[in-house]
Amino acid sequence: QPPPPPDATCHQVRSFFQRLQPGLKWVPETPVPGSDLQVCLPKGPTCCSRKMEEKYQLTARLNMEQLLQSASMELKFLIIQNAAVFQEAFEIVVRHAKNYTNAMFKNNYPSLTPQAFEFVGEFFTDVSLYILGSDINVDDMVNELFDSLFPVIYTQMMNPGLPESVLDINECLRGARRDLKVFGSFPKLIMTQVSKSLQVTRIFLQALNLGIEVINTTDHLKFSKDCGRMLTRMWYCSYCQGLMMVKPCGGYCNVVMQGCMAGVVEIDKYWREYILSLEELVNGMYRIYDMENVLLGLFSTIHDSIQYVQKNGGKLTTTIGKLCAHSQQRQYR
Amino acid sequence: SAYYPEDLFIDKKILKVAHVEHEETLSSRRRELIQKLKSFINFYSALPGYICSHSPVAENDTLCWNGQELVERYSQKAARNGMKNQFNLHELKMKGPEPVVSQIIDKLKHINQLLRTMSVPKGKVLDKSLDEEGLESGDCGDDEDECIGSSGDGMVKVKNQLRFLAELAYDLDVDDAPGNKQHGNQKDNEITTSHSVGNMP
């Protein structure tokens, strides 16, 4: 299909261009020299004008953006869907863990409820927030749980004669809890397990969300003017010569795409590393690195820790009686 | 030993989490995700090839367009940029990634570093310090049944199988997602630009 002779009309070009841009005022009636063209430089007369070239460039860049979006659609769907599923699944685990812990208190230590329910609720609220990326210290969460529980255990189970707990004696009891290692090494055990499992869970979710961000970024890339010109030349300049049905050469397309996507392709190395690192993380997510495992078993460890306090009750009551005597006197007054 | 509520426990020791026939644990779901993600490991290197294969390119025609003229599909001119004098393709590549891409690369570098830091070395699932403190019980069965807590009376074997499929309002099957399945080449050191994005199954 040779280029049209100078006397030929631009009828075919006109009808093709009409699809892109309603309004034919930019298409010459007959081929013109095209000396003002900047992209589709003609070897002879051309059916393109400068305005048409600009429209072609815009369309080429839009085409490219759409192609990129369709390329990433399945991957984007995969990560978005899984990020949502895992986030909800983790919240369900936390909810179950809270219910198990509350059930354990209700069935084994009814005198500690409803206060224990509130402390447990606070703890698991913080667990949820930590997983979602909040600036909360896991050790503080665990310490807070045991600091809160001990005054209630002491006033309800070990020394029931004390009046309704007041913040003053509670603060002394909270301090005693740490100083006397009232719960033995259970708080430390829980800290280790919870912090390890939650850290891994948190980074897993963080990584999935970053994956979405990576795909979104490349999905909405704006291509440079240079790229737009290359794409125009590849996809549309043939039209100017009346070659409507001709397609770009495969090798030429690859060269143009690599030029347009040179920046994007630089992500490749880090993307590969991202998937392999995520795989490594996932392979290690078991036992104390698996929040499902750790949180759903917390009720048992907390139960054991309270038994430990009960076992040492007599000794503790004497020591704490002396340690918090000042606060207790103030409370009785 | 603690009294465990009937609705939560079978046999007072094994945790019963959900009454669903389809067993799907969080860990199996994670592994499944990784397998699917690995099929996209070549996503970025394969993008140029994918886009060419999904845009009009001469496949069966004898003649094709090289940016300047009609040429034979297998001629030397076919792969050459027909107007290379107008502006340099090499120059375009040398400009480097645009700021948003550089930003995302930095974020990927950061998360990769975090992921590597957090990854558990094989065979080192529990900290040495924990082992030394004697807080880890001896043998607690396979990966599905892990012990938590100190040994002794209160030890509970937690059956690690929350079956979330039943509870989640999502259809977890990604296989019939919109868009074409994309596949590519699996070897890490060999990037082929075929008509695809991703990895060969």
């Epitope: 913080d126 979602l132 809160s148 913040l167 909270r174 | -």
Partner: antibody, heavy 116, light 102 residues
Framework: QVTLKESGPTLVKPTQTLTLTCTFS??????????VGWIRQPPGKALEWLAL???????RYSPSLKSRLTITKDTSKNQVVLTMTNMDPVDTATYYC?????????????WGQGTL | QSVLTQPPSASVAPGKTARITCGGN??????VHWYQQKPGQSPVLVIY???KRPSGIPERFSGSNSGNTATLTISGAQPMDEADYYC?????????FGGGTK
């Protein structure tokens, strides 16, 4: 931006129940980490915390007023309601509702204008 | 009587540094927040989590917290800083305010 507005009766007879509504915009009570709290301030006195409701419907109450207070939320209407039973002249105060960031140790970062 | 103790009043010459304390048993282990309240207005958060300043709060406001005392510092106090200041902390499941410092 975040705004909160308290509404309710200006006068309540002793022994009656006070119902206060906090209508807010700029955030949702279904977002993880968000809470809404109620605080009161008798004329010329200090601030006193009454109740706090979390995004996950957990509720916290002042121990000294717990038996008289109920806090509820209507996520779709962007409202939180506080009811206080058995009102007494000593309960005369300006009642504020505030947005709480639960993760930041329950800080109250945005306050309503208050209702007397 | 509040578990968080604040001096009822404090005064400072303009341009000088004002320090308001908030005392409480082992308060250093808690996160303390500070609010400023001008007459007839709602309280405004000026410092949260001991030391953090919300956007829009001047740099002259700073906080610290250790042992049994949390402190709000106003460096180069200005007449517009005249107000009541309240400290607040979260005790397990209870929100506690100090008695306020004028």
């Amino acid at each position: 931006q975040v705004t909160l507005k308290e509404s309710g009766p200006t006068l309540v007879k002793p022994t009656q129940t006070l119902t206060l509504t906090c209508t807010f915009s700029g955030f949702s009570l279904s977002t993880s980490g968000v809470g809404v709290g109620w605080i009161r301030q008798p004329p010329g006195k200090a601030l006193e915390w009454l109740a706090l409701i979390y995004w996950n419907d957990d509720k916290r109450y002042s121990p000294s007023l717990k038996s008289r207070l109920t806090i509820t939320k209507d996520t779709s209407k962007n409202q939180v309601v506080l009811t206080m039973t058995n009102m007494d002249p000593v309960d005369t105060a300006t009642y504020y509702c505030a947005h709480s960031r639960i993760a930041a140790r329950r800080v109250l970062d945005y306050w309503g204008q208050g209702t007397l | 009587q509040s578990v968080l103790t604040q001096p009822p009043s404090a005064s400072v010459a303009p341009g000088k540094t004002a320090r308001i304390t908030c005392g409480g048993n082992n308060i250093g282990s808690k996160s303390v927040h500070w609010y400023q309240q001008k007459p007839g207005q709602s309280p405004v958060l000026v410092i949260y989590q001991d030391t953090k300043r919300p956007s829009g709060i001047p740099e002259r406001f700073s906080g610290s917290n250790s042992g049994n005392t949390a402190t709000l510092t106003i460096s180069g106090a200005q007449p517009m800083d005249e107000a009541d200041y309240y400290c607040q902390a979260w005790y397990s499941t209870i929100m506690v305010f100090g008695g306020g410092t004028k």
